[in-house]
Interface confidence: low
């Protein structure tokens, strides 16, 4: 439905508060280096303009597209060239090329200072002094560090952030109330950002068809009682929502997400029996709840898949008729029967089925050719099952920190060219699969583990894409979205790698390590471990373990010493010498 003024339409649909928040997120995700005050000024100008359009949709410029209005506004930033360099060239382009240009300059790893959490009393004072500015600042800081964060979901996080301060700043022990809530929001926020980044990568790098296939599989697992046509409608609408958000169209995205939640709740009888509680919540909570809702129970009377997809004489006729619809039906039917499989496994099975039909439907006897197609699925199913079993056993034996270290060594040997901070970040996240998924029963382990690994490996892919250094990473990241994890799993030690020269500075530590949190201390140690492997890729597990044990003892000893700095200097030299000897450096 066409509107005279798109900006007025979205302002009326979303309301002023959400409109302003979403425009701030959009601007902060595009111009990630701009100061907070500059963005607030731009947002206020856009909001005042939107209000004039609400009053009179025929007013000057009200008929312009949102991309034109927002792009024009961003291009008024005086320091664009000094701050952003070639991104300023985007402003010479016309829409839609200008918006595409801005999108291409989004930085997954912007050079921004780490967010340091102030004292609780300082935060509570700031919250009480100016609640609106305090919450805007939260949106701004998250959005600029996570340029693909799912905007309507960020509004939900901000609502929880506000609720935490409202409750805890009145509590007797403010810190005990607030800090766990902020930790939870931080961890959930990072996970949410990474999940959305995979959705955007899927759409942008592999296209709408790839995203739709993912969505068919996931929604069919979640809503196994829904008809195929119903699932297809949800997939189409969900694809539109995520295409918009990934494309920077945050107002449209939030509006369409609200419409989708409304539709789902109005039609929950034909979708899922698990939606009742979600649908009683306010909008932001409702949308979040629907996105996280547990799988409905499978219908009891589902017939064998073989009848329609193997035994039927019409398989090739049905396939030729509408290939994507027939494959969609296959994926739907398989996924609704297998909540115990990961989405990426289901997509591998569908791809195998498609490849078989392409080959067999051109053969002399198609039925004879594809009769055994389901037998080809067995090894595809067993591979992730075995991998998860082995890694969960290793995790249970080592615990999270040492399991992360095992993965650090494994991945540094596979792709030693990747930067140390990226290897540490990615391997730490890969290692979290243990505590996240290994506690689950068998039936839930694979969807938990493999789909989580897809999210983490996508982080590696987007970080590597910014500064490509490894052909092996590029190959695994670009060849097939669903085979990324098997591709990385299959990589052996990179025999072509020339070890890094030894640099004692890398292994020099100071007393400041003693005041770090346990997590930060672990990261320091894990950074040293990666550097060791880069120096000595052929080092055995035993050698590396011995050096890391010595290192841990050294840190503990010097942190207990009276003159910490002297201890780190003197004992550090001894440790470096001993490590060099142990590793034959």
């Amino acid at each position: 439905d066409a509107h005279k003024s798109e900006v007025a339409h979205r302002f009326k649909d979303l309301g002023e508060e959400n409109f302003k928040a979403l425009v701030l997120i959009a601007f902060a995700q595009y111009l990630q280096q701009c100061p907070f005050e500059d963005h607030v000024k731009l947002v206020n100008e856009v909001t005042e303009f939107a209000k004039t359009c609400v009053a009179d949709e025929s007013a000057e410029n009200c008929d312009k597209s949102l991309h034109t209005l927002f792009g024009d506004k961003l291009c008024t930033v005086a320091t664009l060239r000094e701050t952003y360099g070639e991104m300023a060239d985007c402003c010479a382009k016309q829409e839609p090329e200008r918006n595409e240009c801005f999108l291409q300059h989004k930085d997954d790893n912007p050079n921004l200072p780490r967010l340091v959490r102030p004292e609780v009393d300082v935060m509570c004072t700031a919250f009480h002094d100016n609640e609106e500015t305090f919450l805007k600042k939260y949106l701004y800081e998250i959005a600029r560090r996570h340029p693909y964060f799912y905007a309507p979901e960020l509004l939900f996080f901000a609502k929880r952030y506000k609720a935490a301060f409202t409750e805890c700043c009145q509590a007797a022990d403010k810190a005990a109330c607030l800090l766990p809530k902020l930790d939870e929001l931080r961890d959930e926020g990072k996970a949410s950002s990474a999940k959305q980044r995979l959705k955007c990568a899927s759409l942008q790098k592999f296209g709408e068809r790839a995203f739709k296939a993912w969505a068919v599989a996931r929604l069919s697992q979640r809503f196994p009682k829904a008809e195929f046509a119903e699932v297809s409608k949800l997939v189409t609408d969900l694809t539109k929502v995520h295409t918009e958000c990934c494309h920077g169209d945050l107002l449209e995205c939030a509006d369409d997400r609200a419409d989708l939640a409304k539709y789902i709740c109005e039609n929950q009888d034909s979708i899922s029996s698990k939606l009742k509680e979600c649908c009683e919540k306010p909008l932001l909570e409702k949308s979040h709840c629907i996105a996280e809702v547990e799988n409905d129970e499978m219908p009891a009377d589902l017939p064998s898949l073989a009848a329609d997809f193997v035994e039927s004489k019409d398989v090739c006729k049905n396939y030729a008729e509408a290939k994507d619809v027939f494959l969609g039906m296959f994926l739907y039917e398989y996924a609704r029967r297998h909540p115990d499989y990961s989405v990426v496994l289901l997509l591998r099975l569908a791809k195998t089925y498609e490849t078989t039909l392409e080959k067999c439907c051109a053969a002399a006897d198609p039925h004879e050719c594809y009769a055994k197609v389901f037998d080809e699925f067995k090894p595809l199913v067993e591979e992730p099952q075995n991998l998860i079993k082995q890694n969960c056993e290793l995790f249970e034996q080592l615990g999270e920190y040492k399991f992360q270290n095992a993965l650090l060594v494994r991945y540094t040997k596979k792709v030693p060219q990747v930067s140390t901070p990226t290897l540490v970040e990615v391997s730490r996240n890969l290692g979290k699969v243990g505590s996240k998924c290994c506690k689950h029963p068998e039936a839930k382990r694979m969807p938990c583990a493999e789909d989580y690994l897809s999210v983490v490996l996508n982080q590696l892919c987007v970080l590597h894409e910014k500064t490509p250094v490894s052909d092996r990473v590029t190959k695994c990241c670009t060849e097939s979205l669903v085979n990324r994890r098997p591709c990385f799993s299959a990589l052996e030690v990179d025999e072509t790698y020339v070890p890094k020269e030894f640099n004692a500075e890398t292994f020099t530590f100071h007393a400041d390590i003693c005041t770090l949190s346990e997590k930060e201390r672990q990261i320091k140690k894990q950074t040293a471990l990666v550097e060791l492997v880069k120096h000595k890729p052929k080092a055995t597990k035993e050698q590396l373990k011995a050096v890391m044990d010595d290192f841990a003892a050294f840190v503990e000893k010097c942190c207990k010493a009276d003159d910490k700095e002297t201890c780190f200097a003197e004992e550090g030299k001894k440790l470096v010498a001993a490590s060099q000897a142990a590793l034959g450096l």
């Epitope: 195929f228 046509a229 119903e230 297809s232 409608k233 997939v235 189409t236 039927s312 019409d314 006729k317 049905n318 030729a320 008729e321 509408a322 994507d324 619809v325 027939f326 039906m329």
Partner: nanobody
Amino acid sequence: QVQLVESGGGLVQPGGSLRLSCAASGFAFRGFGMSWVRQAPGKGFEWVSSINNGGSDTRYADSVKGRFTISRDNARNTLYLQMNSLKPEDTAVYYCAIGGPGASPSGQGTQVTVSS
């Protein structure tokens, strides 16, 4: 809700013509192959014709080949069946369905009666 509403049926003499329409809503019409199926009194469903999602590929049952034409308008979310040279054995309730041959109807159908 997924909805398929058939219309255009009626009473027609042998040799006459009718044009059936099927208005689709509640799903991504342009993404799906569509079919017409029919059910004669006291009989099971019989596939009549199918068209792929773009409209470039059409299929017909031998019994209607050369007389019926299936088409679609994706802008209007509508499926059509042009029926010429109608015969008494074409008498049936006609349904549109999502998918290719073998698709199951979900609408109410439209009655076509060919009789002199």
